[in-house]
Every structure is written in C-alpha cells, then in structure tokens.
C-alpha cells in the first residue's frame, strides 16, 4: 500500500478501504490550453486508411460519450482512389481510464476502468506467412 | 448543483463542493477481458507513416507513464521503403482523462485533468492551398 | 452565460436545401456535442441527429440519413445542419441544443431559439 | 427504436392541484429521462434530469422518478405559469426519442 507523505494539507481519509478509494475533483483542469493546430479532425476522411466515427454512448461512465474509429476498407486508397489489398488498414487502439457510477446511478461515486478505444486507422504492410 | 437520485445505496457527500468532489474507487476494472489479437504492437513499425514511442513520465499524474507516438517522417514511406513528400505523416490525437494529485504529493486527493496524446500516426493526402 | 443562437426563418421550395446556424458562447464548444431536433406545427420533438465538434463525428436519426448533413465549424464555434431534397412535411421548427458528452446525466440543458424553415412552392 | 408513451396527451387542472404525468418505454430498460417543458413559441426547457435532479432555476414543486419503464413527471401545487406542454426524452438508446406531449390546461 502507499504510505501517506508528512503532508498535513493532505484531505485525511479514515475509509476501510483506503488508499483504493480517493476523491476526485471533477472540475476538469484542460492541459490543453492552446488549441493545436496540427489536432485536425479531418484527418478521417483525408487518411490512406480512412475512418468512420461510431458514437458509443454510456450513461453510468464519465466520459458518457466516445467517439470511436472504425477502418472502411480492409486494403489502403491509392492516389488514384482505388483501394489496394496489398496493404492494410488497422485501427490505431489505446487503453483509456474512464470513471464507472458504482452503485449505478449515483452521482458522486465511481470506479477506475480501463477500456480499449479505437481511435484511428494507418496503413500497414501486411504480414506475409510463407507456407514451407 | 446536483441532489443526490433517490437511491439509498448511494454514499453522500457533505463537502462543499458537492458534486465537483467525488469518491473513486482505484481497484481498476479491466473491461478487455480477452487480449485483443489485432492490437498488435508492431504498427508502428509496419505503417506506412511510422512512428516512434516516447516515454513521459509523471509522478504526479495516474497513470504515471505514458507512451506517446511522433512521426518519424514528414511524408509517408512507399512500397519501395522510399519516403512519398507527396503524403503526409500525421499524428492521431485524442484526449484522455489522467488523475492528477491535488494538493502535490497527496495519496488519495486528485483532480481530473485531460490531456491530449499523441497515439500513433496516419498517412493523409495534403492540403494544398492555390495561390490566386 | 451559456447561449446558443441560431439563424433566421427560411423559406424554401420543394425539392431544395436548407442550411441552418447554431453558434455556441459561453463555453468549451469542443466539449459538448451539438444536437438537432425539430418540431412540426402542432406535434411533439423529433431528433434529428449529434455532430461531435471535436472529432468531426455524426450520427443520425435513420429517417434523416442521407438527407441531414451535420456539421461544425471549430474556429467559430457554430453548428450546421443542412437539409436536402425538402418536402412540405420538413415545414417546422429546428433547434439545436447541447449535449455534455463528459456526463450524460446533464443532458440536453440550453438550447437554441429555434428556426422557423417553411417548406412550399 | 424504444417508443415514449406519455398519459395523458392532455389533462385540465386547476392552480393548487398536484399533477401526474407518466411516461412508458415501450421496450428494454431506460438508463435516464429528462422532462421538458415548452410554452408556445418557445424552446424547450429543461426542468428534470437524469430521472430525478432538478435543473437550475427549477422550482422544488417539480419532482421526478420512476426507473426501468416506467417514469413519472409530479407537480405538487399547480402555479398559473405551469400551464404548458410537457415532454419526456430517454437518453442512451439509439436513437433519442421523445414522448408525444403532454398538454396542462387551466380547468
């Protein structure tokens, strides 16, 4: 378990379960303070392997709404805009902590999840297994 | 703000800043039960707009490690492992939630905090703008 | 303070488009989502759709696929919503409001004035 | 798609009167509703979210509850500025669907 540090501005906490239960200001702190210029969001049309956004949506989590990637095409667009199978699109996939409502539906009580997100696609050369 | 739902089972907050302060249960429920065979960690090698995986540490921050993605190339590789200027490598970005101690030092106080990373990178066909 | 303003009555023929205004203040616009709903004169609150601001994202109401075209645009915080191949049936109000995807139990809390788009030959 | 079924589609009530509008799913379980109401020429306004919290600026005589299917919109003590139409909206199921109305008239 972690010890607690000999900081008395720390909140106590006397919960049974401590340290796995903390509290959480919610008031989100956005890191991102200038919008980034290069974070285009039209890259899912403009990708050699493009993609379609799903909307995944989930009351009981915080974030309630993500928008995931799903590759169109099994193969890479060429310049030309055809699609060629010698390569493939995959979906790019990051694990991402969200807040479960646990019990359900209560507003000020959560759980730590990690879930898998798709969050775009590139293009891969395919691996080739040689039969002997 | 928010009264608590007529749910019983839920635990109440006296703080003052209710709902902004909540519980959270850092006991991480992994929802990807099975590993996922096609999330493969060779992509980054393989796309045609390969990246390199960066480690940004913080001791303050959960998770504490992240693996962000830069793009090795402007462009974006040909069949022929030449780079294509024509193409452009770009990164996928999104934005996650982290935990973040609040006061410094604290075990079990955090704020949320989003962050934009980088994740891996795409190929995407420029946009050229035509001079009059 | 929050608002969403939305542009003027429209008055279109049949079988023409239709594109309508939503521009957010007051907040992050990236966000929340912005959704559509519109209402005939007399009847009740149909949905249209949800356009994502930030990821570009779109999901319609299946009796208006292919039809809307959802859309936003960042730099100035404002929402579209385009209607095609308009019938007299499409004569109604349209509203967008926002959408707290962080934490759906907000729901839809603001909402625009509402645009009044009459539909006739 | 889940269907919002709202009784009654219209009711007559007097000031004081303690109202009841209800409102079915016609399928499955709603994780949430929100109650609406809209006066003539008027966007909607948001009086109830997430089934039972009362947004900001609502007076306490509105109430929520209900879970499941089955949810229910009260009015302890009608006030002459409630007179109005009402509208439930489940949220969370493809797509968003929004009961017919409820109108309150003046008895």
């Known amino acids: 378990g972690i010890a607690i540090p000999r900081n008395s501005g720390c909140p106590n906490s006397e919960d049974k379960n401590f340290p796995r239960t903390v509290m959480v200001n919610l008031n989100i702190h956005n890191r991102n303070t200038s919008t980034n210029p290069k974070r285009s969001s039209d890259y899912y049309n403009r990708s050699t392997s493009p993609w379609n956004l799903h909307r995944n949506e989930d009351p009981e989590r915080y974030p309630s709404v993500i928008w995931e990637a799903k590759c169109r095409h099994l193969g890479c667009v060429k310049a030309d805009g055809n699609v060629d199978y010698h390569m493939n699109s995959v979906p790019i996939q990051q694990e991402i902590l969200v807040l479960r409502r646990e019990p359900r539906h209560c507003p000020n009580s959560f759980r730590l999840e990690k879930i898998l997100v798709s969050v775009g696609c590139t293009c891969v050369t395919p691996i080739v297994h040689h039969v002997a | 703000g928010i009264a608590i739902p007529r749910n019983s089972g839920c635990p109440n907050s006296e703080d003052k800043n209710f709902p902004r302060t909540v519980m959270v249960n850092l006991n991480i429920h992994n929802r990807n039960t099975s590993t996922n065979p096609k999330r493969s960690s060779d992509y980054y090698n393989r796309s045609t707009s390969p990246w390199n995986l960066h480690r940004n540490e913080d001791p303050e921050r959960y998770p504490s490690v992240i693996w962000e993605a830069k793009c090795r190339h402007l462009g974006c590789v040909k069949a022929d492992g030449n780079v294509d200027y024509h193409m452009n490598s770009v990164p996928i970005q999104q934005e996650i939630l982290v935990l973040r101690r609040e006061p410094r030092h604290c075990p079990n106080s955090f704020r949320l905090e989003k962050i934009l990373v980088s994740v891996g990178c795409t190929c995407v066909t420029p946009i050229v703008h035509h001079v009059a | 303070e929050v608002q969403l303003v939305q542009s003027g009555a429209e008055v279109k023929k049949p079988g023409s488009s239709v594109k309508v205004s939503c521009k957010a203040s007051g907040y992050t616009f990236d966000d929340y989502e912005i959704h559509w709903v519109r209402q005939a004169p007399g009847q009740g609150l149909e949905w249209i759709g949800v356009?994502?601001?930030?990821?570009?994202?779109?999901f319609y109401n299946q009796k208006f696929d292919g039809r809307a075209t959802l859309t936003a645009d960042k730099s100035t915080s404002t929402a579209y919503m385009e209607l095609s191949s308009l019938r007299s049936e499409d004569t109604a109000v349209y509203y967008c409001?926002?959408?707290?995807?962080?934490?759906?139990?907000?729901?839809?809390?603001?909402w625009g004035q509402g645009t009044t788009v009459t539909v006739s030959s | 798609d889940i269907q919002m079924t709202q009784s009654p589609s219209s009711l007559s009530a007097s000031v004081g009167d303690r109202v009841t509008i209800t409102c079915s799913a016609s399928s499955g379980s709603i994780s949430y509703i929100d109650w609406f109401q809209q006066k003539p020429g008027k966007a909607p306004k948001r009086l109830i979210y997430a089934t039972f919290e009362l947004a900001s600026g609502v007076p306490s005589r509105f109430s929520g509850s209900g879970s499941g299917t089955d949810f229910t919109l009260t009015i302890s003590s009608l006030q002459p500025e409630d007179f109005a139409t009402y509208y439930c909206h489940q949220l969370g199921s493809y797509p968003d669907t929004f009961g017919q109305g409820t109108k309150l008239e003046i008895k």
């Open positions: 356009n994502d601001p930030e990821s570009g994202g779109t």
């Open positions: 409001t926002r959408y707290d995807k962080w934490d759906s139990f907000y729901g839809m809390d603001y």
